[in-house]
């Protein structure tokens, strides 16, 4: 009879996914250990035939229409370890017949997500589960948790309650879960965490609620184990008091309403008045705390999308292990890290999209910083060696500021310029949209950049030797949208150059690439090129993969090299069908349709073809 049920069977695993089944098949091998019935149309789960499969360890009943569980339906499945009833209709009245799920003695993971379960009903559904390790109640309709919600689950370690409508968590709701280490309460309606006391918890996700305050319980001897705390997308007005959480490694506070205080705390004892903002800073650990240095273990701190106007010195002082700091999309006007040893482990600092006008980085601060994101600020008169002092800096984005690069020592200045020479670690630099008027000779000497973007600086003049020193390292160069009429850059000398973007300028000539180079992508869109002679482009034939030429007044005759590329297909020229060229009569045709004889009329013989 097995051929009647088109389930896939491999070893002791049976997959009956999405077969339109209305009931549990009764013809499966009795020694089946894994049974996947997800995505069918089961409405009720009966002890028979389910009870035949006494060897079952994994049972997936998710995404069905189950609204009825026969009492004792799972009783015979004494080896069952993993049970998923996610995305069914367990909230319907018929699911509430006495006993709910009944006892699940060996089940270690249970998924009840997406069942419209509401408070009260859940307590009747959950039975004794002494081995339960992971429980998902996500995407239901729970509004509150009581001290009776989670009883008889002494082994529970992971509890997922995301996407409910929880507004209230009664004191002691998690008291019966002494081993709970992971708790997901994201996407609920919580407004306040006033007495956080789950000492054993390691991971807590409170993102996407309406939390205005987070306060740990005042137990001076408490050793909280929390290492991961997500509070993003809430309504926090202040930096939470985390002094009791010395093991915190990951902290996400993005998308809140946080401001940091500018003055000293009014009260040096206990909880500082929220009105001062010092509820706030992790400035002192509780007296009984072994670590004594709050946030000293923190590796990742995200404060993006808040309302921070100033970072007090004392705030950065304790963050001695921090590797990633995101302060983007705030209201910062200045940022300082001047002290020796300030943020010694920081590898990524994102200060993008603030209102930064000044940036002061000490000569020996930020010694590990590799990535500095400063795009979308108002930086102008920076200390000239701001970036040269960052010994490990590899990637720097200054797009949308007003930074002017200095020339080399024999082209010094001008006043207010910033030095980009001698930064031996720097590999990627964006100076897009900085209103740079002149790029002086020697601007990047001894800075082995692989990527340089100087686009959107209309009117930019690139002096001879401005890119000197980059010949052996540069792989990507963008000079798009600068209105360049001539390019004072000896491009064929850039032996590693792979991508060159010269779009949206007024160029009509390129230097001759006579010997083979590495160029793979050349973007010449919206320029003034009429000819791309083979004498200039010959050296590119072996490497060039893509050539973008739209928006140029190409001549139909004299472009033999280009026509050859179109016909032989060695180079992928963009929009081949629409690449328009002009005859001397101003007649416009598609370049790919031009024949040699078209260019012989009137003595226009094309010597390249």
């Amino acid at each position: 009879h097995q051929d009647k049920v088109p389930c896939k069977m491999v070893d002791k695993k049976v997959s009956c996914q999405v077969l339109g089944l209305l009931q549990v098949p009764s013809v499966l091998p009795p020694d089946t250990e894994t049974l996947d019935l997800s995505g069918n149309q089961l409405r009720s789960i009966l002890a028979s035939p389910l009870g035949f499969y006494t060897a079952l360890r994994h049972l997936d009943l998710s995404t069905n229409e189950i609204s009825f569980l026969q009492p004792g339906a799972f009783q015979a499945l004494t080896h069952l370890e993993h049970l998923s009833l996610a995305h069914n209709r367990l909230a319907m009245a018929t699911a509430l017949s006495a006993g709910g799920l009944g006892p699940l003695p060996r089940v270690t993971s249970l998924d009840l997500s997406g069942n419209s379960l509401y408070s009260g009903l859940l307590e009747r559904l959950l039975g004794e589960a002494p081995s339960l390790h992971t429980l998902s109640l996500a995407e239901n309709s729970l509004t509150r948790l009581t001290r009776h919600t989670f009883r008889d689950m002494p082994a529970l370690e992971q509890l997922d309650l995301h996407s409910n409508v929880l507004m209230d968590i009664e004191d002691g709701a998690f008291e019966g879960l002494p081993r709970l280490t992971h708790l997901n309460l994201s996407r609920n309606s919580l407004t306040c965490i006033s007495d956080f006391s789950l000492q054993q918890l390691r991971v807590l996700d409170l993102s996407c609620n309406s939390i205005e305050a987070f306060q740990t319980a005042s137990q001076p001897q408490a050793e909280f184990q929390l290492t991961w705390l997500d509070l993003r997308e809430n309504k926090l007005l202040h930096f939470p008091d985390l002094a009791a959480l010395p093991r915190l490694i990951y902290l996400n506070l993005s998308n809140n309403l946080i401001r940091l205080p500018t003055g000293p705390p009014q009260d040096s004892k206990g909880i500082h008045a929220p009105s001062e903002g010092w509820s706030a800073l992790p400035l002192s650990a509780p007296s009984g705390n072994a670590s004594g240095r709050p946030l000293s273990q923190l590796l990742n701190l995200d404060l993006s999308y808040n309302e921070i106007e100033l970072i007090p010195d004392s705030f950065l002082e304790h963050l001695t292990s921090l590797c990633f700091l995101n302060l983007s999309r705030n209201c910062l006007r200045t940022f300082e890290a001047r002290r020796l040893g300030s943020l010694p482990c920081l590898m990524l600092l994102d200060l993008s999209h603030n209102a930064l006008e000044t940036l002061e980085l000490g000569a020996r601060a930020l010694g590990s910083l590799r990535t500095l994101l400063l795009q979308g600020n108002a930086l102008r008169d920076l200390p000239p060696y701001t970036f040269a002092n960052l010994a490990s800096l590899q990637r720097l984005n200054l797009q949308g500021n007003r930074v002017s690069p200095c020339g080399g020592p024999d082209e010094p200045g001008p006043s207010g310029c910033v030095a980009f020479s001698g930064i031996t670690s720097l590999r990627s630099l964006s100076l897009v949209d900085n209103e740079i008027e002149l790029l002086r000779a020697g601007a990047f000497l001894h800075t082995p950049l692989t990527e340089l973007d100087l686009s959107s600086n209309p009117g930019l003049e690139v002096a001879t030797g401005a890119l000197g020193g980059l010949e052996a390292s540069l792989e990507v160069l963008a000079l798009q949208g600068n209105g360049l009429m001539v390019l004072q850059v000896d491009l064929p000398c850039f032996i590693c150059l792979k991508r060159l973007n010269l779009a949206e300028n007024r160029l009509s000539h390129l230097p001759a690439w006579t010997q083979a180079v590495s160029l793979e992508v050349l973007d010449l869109r919206n320029n003034s090129f009429s000819l791309l002679p083979g004498s200039a482009m010959g050296g590119l034939e072996t490497s060039l993969r893509r050539l973008y030429l739209q928006g140029n007044p190409l001549s139909c005759c004299g472009n033999g090299w280009l026509a050859a590329q179109l016909h032989q297909g060695r180079v992928d020229v963009d929009a081949t069908q629409d690449l328009i060229c002009r005859f001397s009569s101003q007649e416009e045709v598609s370049l790919s349709h031009v024949r040699p004889e078209d260019c012989e009329k009137g003595g226009l013989k094309n010597i390249n073809l």
């Epitope: 000239p384 020592p409 010094p412 200045g413 031996t424 001894h446």
Partner: antibody
Framework: EVQLLESGGGLVQPGGSLRLSCAAS????????MSWIRQAPGKGLEWVSG????????HYADSVKGRFTISRDNSKNTLYLQMNSLRAEDTAVYYC???????????WGQGTLVTVSS | QSVLTQPPSASGTPGQRVTISCTGS?????????VHWYQQLPGTAPKLLIY???NRPSGVPDRFSGSKSGTSASLAISGLRSEDEADYYC???????????FGGGTKLTVL
Amino acid sequence: EVQLLESGGGLVQPGGSLRLSCAASGFTFSDYYMSWIRQAPGKGLEWVSGVSWNGSRTHYADSVKGRFTISRDNSKNTLYLQMNSLRAEDTAVYYCARQRQLAEFDYWGQGTLVTVSS
Amino acid sequence: QSVLTQPPSASGTPGQRVTISCTGSSSNIGAGYVVHWYQQLPGTAPKLLIYADTNRPSGVPDRFSGSKSGTSASLAISGLRSEDEADYYCQSYDSSLRGWVFGGGTKLTVL
């Protein structure tokens, strides 16, 4: 620690020649522009000559152009100043100095005295 | 005659604030070239005090500050101390001379 040590100064007759050396240590010599600056007894500072990191570009003050030649040997971490057709007004303490990108002289040697006298 | 003009001398009493000026022209300071300041204690080599108009190298006390406007630059020393007694020089680049130029120097006396 950055160190610059000049040598080669001494007494020379007008019209004579002298070669000054400056031994550099404690930094990557080949990354820096280098200059010679002099100071006549009781007078102010005067920039004499400068050379780019690889020696390809040299600059001179008008007062020494055609008589002095600056050079460098990056393999020896040494800067040189060849002084020919010396005059009495060339008498001074000669300092070698390192220049950063903004052309400031951030490190100086202790100086070597050149006396041109008959 | 130096290209950059400084007063030959300046003086002040301990704790006072003194300012030393450096006047150039449209081919040096006025052209936007940066100005640097040096301190030369008696019998020693000059030492960089201020670079790029306003910036102090590490180790230089914040009593020393620089400013620039138009064709002139200034060095200010507040809270004057006896150890500040020295010669002070400004320096810039001159595009017409195509070289670096110094001021004539100012001898500061702490009374």
